[in-house]
């Protein structure tokens, strides 16, 4: 066990042109804080993947207000170290992500708002117990200077914090086969206590409680010799005496359990027993808890009461991300219906509705004809948020109040002449045409394309359109 320690020295504009604007202003004072995420090995995982070695948040730094006209200086930093405890062996190689966050302290509704200013990442080799390592990383126009180290927590020592030290039993020297513990010369390296029953001849351990087998031996306690002779059973020893084992792809082969988890085979698959602070099918998820305050922007932390359980952040409307760190353009979801205009006011969404629609999301189609009378026998027709009158013959206009000129549309075909009449229009047809709109030619022999003209009317007589 031990602790990874990170000391931030400075965060400010990097060298060269294009210095960033100060993230704080007189109108919007702010302060910084940092988050570190550690993963074992030289992984190139996404920033969102679990911080399997652990994570930590710094305290908030002092409040900073930009001086007008001054270039952005190095910004005031939080006091103290960021410390990430690790329970098991230090892996020696690790990946880190360091995020610089800005907490705005302006007048915005709902108190502080958080935003990510910069994120740096890297992969490093580091032995536990060594000196501070210094580093400089750049993110855009920003530069972060920091130091880090890994140190073992007593009684662990060594480059991986796997050796244990105990106070000397005799004043002069350590017991047989045991070395003094550097740098604690007054203590002695303690023998590791392997898993109970682990074969002293064929097994060994690098961490307390484990039992790793020398080549040629197998079994949980390294008591079963490996043989390549044929077996009755497809996998595993046919009997304790023959010690026959045909290598086969077992679910625990290669130990799928991360972060020091121990693997045990189950009838269907495998099961990982995870060390405290890790969870998940393969012990791949680290133990940031709700007590660490991981939810920003008013997010509520759910679950995660202890390091053995996951937390999730329920984000207020307008924020998303695993820590509610991303602001959402809520209008991009097009919440306003029927062509309404969306306004994101921060504390609420507003929809400005088109005529004929109402409701918080313009979801209600108003009864356009309610209280609307169409004059002169017209009937109201709803549509698209506006009412329309279908007017009786001889009337027009929005409300059918205007007397229409029925001849305006030139309804009489083939040169017929139109006459307005109290009940509509009358077409006087040109010679050779007949019909209400003079649409039918009269045949040369006097027969028409229609049945015979109505009695009392000769072809060519004006015909009233009723």
């Amino acid at each position: 066990a031990g602790v990874f320690e990170l000391q931030i020295h400075s965060f400010g504009p990097g060298p060269g042109p294009g210095a960033p604007r100060s993230p704080c202003s007189a109108r919007l004072p702010c302060r910084l804080f940092f988050r570190v995420c550690l993963k074992p090995g030289l992984s190139e995982e996404a920033a969102e993947s679990p911080c399997a070695l652990g994570a930590a948040l710094s305290a908030r730094g002092p409040v900073y207000t930009e001086q007008p006209g001054a270039p952005a200086p190095d910004l005031p930093l939080p006091d103290g170290l960021l410390q990430v405890p690790f329970r098991d062996a230090w892996p020696g190689t690790f990946s880190f992500i360091i995020e610089t966050w800005r907490e705005e302290l302006g007048d915005q509704i709902g108190g502080p708002a958080w935003s990510l200013l910069a994120r740096v990442a890297g992969r490093r080799r580091l032995a536990a117990g060594g000196p501070w390592a210094r580093d400089i990383q750049r993110a855009g126009a920003w530069e972060l200077r920091f130091s880090y180290r890994a140190r073992c927590e007593p009684p662990a020592v060594g480059t991986a914090c796997t050796r244990l030290c105990r106070p000397r039993s005799a004043p002069s020297r350590c017991g047989p086969g045991l070395r003094p513990c550097a740098p604690l010369e007054d203590e002695c390296e303690a023998p590791l206590v392997c898993r109970a029953g682990c074969s002293p001849e064929h097994g060994f351990c690098e961490q307390p409680g484990e039992c790793r087998c020398l080549e040629g031996w197998t079994g949980p306690l390294c008591t079963v010799p490996v043989s390549t002779s044929s077996c009755l059973s497809p996998r595993g020893p046919s009997s304790a005496t023959t010690g026959c084992l045909v290598p086969g792809p077992g679910p625990c082969d290669g130990n799928p359990c991360a972060n020091g988890g121990s693997c045990s085979e189950t009838p269907r698959s495998f099961e990982c027993t995870c060390p405290r602070g890790f969870y998940g099918l393969r012990c791949e998820v680290s133990g940031v808890t709700c007590a660490d305050g991981p939810c920003f922007n008013g997010g509520l932390c759910v679950g995660g009461a202890d390091p053995d359980s996951a937390y999730i952040c329920h984000c207020p409307p307008g924020f998303q991300g695993s820590n509610c760190e991303k602001r959402v353009d809520r209008c991009s979801l097009q919440p306003c219906r029927n062509g309404g205009l969306c306004l994101d006011l921060g504390h609420a969404l507003r929809c400005r509705c088109r005529a004929g629609f109402a409701g918080p999301r313009c979801e209600h189609d108003l009864d356009d004809c309610a209280g609307r009378a169409c004059a002169n026998g017209g009937t109201c027709v709803e549509g698209g948020g506006a009412h329309r009158c279908s007017c009786a013959l001889g009337f027009g206009g929005r409300d059918c109040r205007e007397r229409a000129d029925p001849c305006a549309a030139r309804p009489c075909a083939h040169g017929g002449r139109c006459y307005a009449h109290f009940s509509g229009l009358v077409c006087a047809c040109a010679p050779g045409y007949m019909g209400a709109r003079c649409e039918f030619p009269v045949h040369p022999d006097g027969a028409s394309a229609l049945p015979a003209a109505p009695p009392g009317l000769r072809p060519g007589d004006p015909q009233r359109y009723l």
């Epitope: 509704i109 709902g110 502080p112 709700c290 932390c301 679950g303 329920h314 207020p316 609420a348 999301r361």
Partner: antibody, heavy 118, light 108 residues
Framework: QVQLQESGPGLVKPSETLSLTCTVS????????WSWIRQPPGKGLEWIGY???????NYNPSLKSRVTISVDTSKNQFSLKLSSVTAADTAVYYC????????????WGQGTLVTVSS | EIVLTQSPGTLSLSPGERVTLSCRAS???????LAWYQQRPGQAPRLLIY???SRATGIPDRFSGSGSGTDFTLTISRLEPEDFAVYYC?????????FGGGTKLEIK
């Protein structure tokens, strides 16, 4: 301004299910999280749970096995069901909207007293 | 869960006096995610303060909130007759959301 109105029976028999509905006006149910809180006579406030229009829910662990909160966006309503009630569930039940800047309660209904008795 | 303890349970005061109500959390409340409510007899609670110190819309400036971590206070600088009520604190840092037991302000 958002207004909330609780409705439902004021008397429920032991072992039955308490059902209440909260009708929201003056705001879209899609804009907020919506919560139920109760207050036994002469006692303090107890959070029951909340729902988001997307269906996300979160319940008080002390009541989780008996509580269901659901939302009906078409009616601008959300509801509470509490099963296997006992006399200890007698309380004034409030519906409330959760603020958009954090999980505190900015608008409350006037409350409805539900008595559990045979 | 975070347990909120309010003290005192009851306070007897006169109009015009200044009063400070305390709310203590069993664990750190991150980001000052703490709210205060007022409940008058027969009414629903009303939001006064959120974010430990921000006044809600329409709340008179005689109400102020302060504190961080585990200790929070609500101060009423000059008591008005309508301020005699029960006051509750509530944390919204983590689930379950929890309320304090309340402090009753009564007229002396």
């Amino acid at each position: 301004q958002v207004q909330l109105q609780e409705s439902g029976p004021g008397l429920v028999k032991p072992s039955e299910t308490l059902s209440l509905t909260c009708t929201v006006s003056g705001g879209s149910i899609s804009s907020y999280y919506w919560s139920w809180i109760r207050q036994p006579p002469g006692k303090g406030l107890e959070w029951i749970g909340y729902v988001y229009y997307s269906g996300t829910t979160n319940y008080n662990p002390s009541l989780k096995s008996r509580v269901t909160i659901s939302v009906d966006t078409s009616k601008n309503q959300f509801s509470l069901k509490l099963s296997s009630v006992t006399a200890a569930d007698t309380a004034v039940y409030y519906c409330a909207s959760i603020a958009v800047t954090g999980f505190y309660f900015d608008y409350w209904g006037q409350g409805t007293l539900v008595t559990v008795s045979s | 869960e975070i347990v909120l303890t309010q003290s005192p349970g009851t306070l007897s005061l006169s109009p015009g006096e200044r009063v400070t109500l305390s709310c203590r959390a069993s664990q750190r409340v991150n980001n000052n995610y703490l709210a205060w409510y007022q409940q008058r007899p027969g009414q629903a609670p009303r939001l006064l303060i959120y974010g430990a110190s921000s006044r809600a819309t329409g709340i008179p400036d005689r109400f102020s909130g302060s504190g961080s971590g585990t200790d929070f206070t609500l101060t009423i600088s000059r008591l008005e007759p309508e301020d005699f009520a029960v006051y509750y604190c509530q944390q919204y840092d983590r689930s379950p959301l929890t309320f304090g037991g309340g402090t009753k302000l009564e007229i002396k």
